[in-house]
């Protein structure tokens, strides 16, 4: 995971948020786990980052991800209170200058180094779900969510007429 030398960890002072154009409305550090409480971990292998879904040993620290929350101008159908009404999008960054990105051609989720402003592939619409879970929908491909497939993160197409509570697209955020 990101405890390895040479990989900068997040400190109390989060990312410098002075991005040109769109700017986040709040930021926080959290660990990401699946509905079944498996941890999402990140490892440096052959000069590239791999993302794993695994059971963590008890003494092993969970990897933290910087979540930056952005408001979309599109109205949210979920808040339902007429006050904030805006959809939330997030970017997820497990280490400085690297962000999770959707690769729609390969149906995969990858970690890429990129500069701001971030590409649309790095933005995911945040959905609140039951059981204190969330799901992440690709901004670039509505109906496609980050999900778990064969112990890896993948992009999974979800039919809106079916149950969006499908366990493999549900994630938990914890400090």
């Amino acid at each position: 995971a990101f405890g390895i030398s040479g990989v900068p960890k997040y400190t109390r002072a989060l990312h410098d948020s002075s991005i040109t154009g769109i700017s986040p409305i709040t930021e926080s550090l959290a660990s990401l786990s699946t509905y079944n409480d498996q941890s999402i971990t990140f490892a440096l292998e052959d000069e590239s980052y791999e993302i794993y879904v695994e059971d963590l040993k008890k003494d092993k620290k969970k990897d933290k991800v910087l979540l930056s929350y952005y408001e979309s101008q599109h109205p949210s159908s979920e808040s339902g209170d007429g006050v904030d009404g805006k959809m939330l999008m997030v970017t997820l960054s497990p280490t400085k200058d690297f962000w999770l990105q959707a690769n729609n051609k390969e149906h995969s989720v990858e970690l890429h180094k990129c500069e701001k402003p971030l590409p649309d592939q790095a933005f995911f619409v945040l959905h609140n779900r039951s059981f204190n879970c969330v799901s992440f929908e690709c901004k670039t491909d509505p109906g496609v969510f980050i999900g778990v497939k064969d112990n890896h993160l993948a992009l999974i197409k979800v039919d809106y007429s079916e149950n969006l509570g499908s366990e493999n697209i549900l994630f938990k955020l914890s400090e």
Epitope: T26, S79, D81
Partner: antibody, heavy 123, light 108 residues
Framework: EVQLVETGGGLIQPGGSLRLSCAAS????????MSWVRQAPGKGLEWVSA????????YYADSVKGRFTISRDNSKNTLYLQMNSLRAEDTAVYYC????????????????WGQGTLVTVSS | EIVLTQSPGTLSLSPGERATLSCRAS??????LSWYQQKPGQAPRLLIY???HRLTGIPDRFSGSGSGTDFTLTISRLEPEDFAVYYC??????????FGGGTKVEIK
């Protein structure tokens, strides 16, 4: 209409206990982190405590840690603040407040505030 | 605990003038900072969140700027209803969250 209504305030002797309630309506309560903020007469705002949407994470100001307990009942759309070992310096109007966005975590500004309930600790 | 220091404590201005309120954090809070207006006998009212995002319905004479440790609330042209107390509030991770001591904007 989105609304927060605090109840439970009153006059209490030092060392006593009181439980404040905050009834929420007009929004999906479990989606939002909630906080208690207080304001002593003629003074500024002081954040007291916060709780995540699920109730799984709670946070306290140092001044109330070990004496106050925040909790929520999502089935009743209600937030609570149990206050024990009350002191004269706890005298204040207590507001409950809701975060802007349904992030469930506590890291957000407060958009909805109740009207406040006055707690007076005096012998 | 992160300490927020607001200055000045009191600002005496006339309607139509520009008000500049400062909030300094004892350590970085990123962009996790908001501004509230409070009038006597009322609950606080959110104006700005995420350091620079104006809440829907708040007049555009209110603007926020800054990140890290130094933040500013600017009221470009004071209206009679703007005379009130203004508080900054940080909600950076991890808690405790804190409020600044407030700046009173009064009529000169």
């Amino acid at each position: 209409e989105v609304q927060l209504v605090e109840t439970g305030g009153g006059l209490i002797q030092p060392g006593g206990s009181l439980r404040l309630s905050c009834a929420a309506s007009g929004f999906t309560f479990s989606f939002y982190a909630m906080s208690w903020v207080r304001q002593a007469p003629g003074k500024g705002l002081e954040w007291v405590s916060a709780i995540s949407g699920s109730g799984g994470s709670t946070y306290y100001a140092d001044s109330v840690k070990g004496r106050f307990t925040i909790s929520r009942d999502n089935s009743k759309n209600t937030l609570y603040l149990q206050m024990n070992s009350l002191r004269a310096e706890d005298t204040a109007v207590y507001y409950c407040a809701r975060t802007i966005h349904g992030i469930r975590a506590a890291y957000d500004a407060f958009i909805i505030w109740g009207q406040g309930t006055l707690v007076t600790v005096s012998s | 605990e992160i300490v927020l220091t607001q200055s000045p404590g009191t600002l005496s201005l006339s309607p139509g003038e520009r008000a500049t309120l400062s909030c300094r954090a004892s350590q970085s809070v990123g962009i996790n900072l908001s501004w509230y207006q409070q009038k006597p006998g009322q609950a606080p009212r959110l104006l700005i969140y995420g350091a620079s995002h104006r809440l829907t319905g708040i007049p555009d004479r209110f603007s926020g700027s800054g990140s890290g440790t130094d933040f500013t609330l600017t009221i470009s042209r004071l209206e009679p209803e703007d005379f009130a107390v203004y508080y900054c509030h940080q909600y950076s991770q991890p808690p405790p969250f804190t409020f600044g001591g407030g700046t009173k904007v009064e009529i000169k």
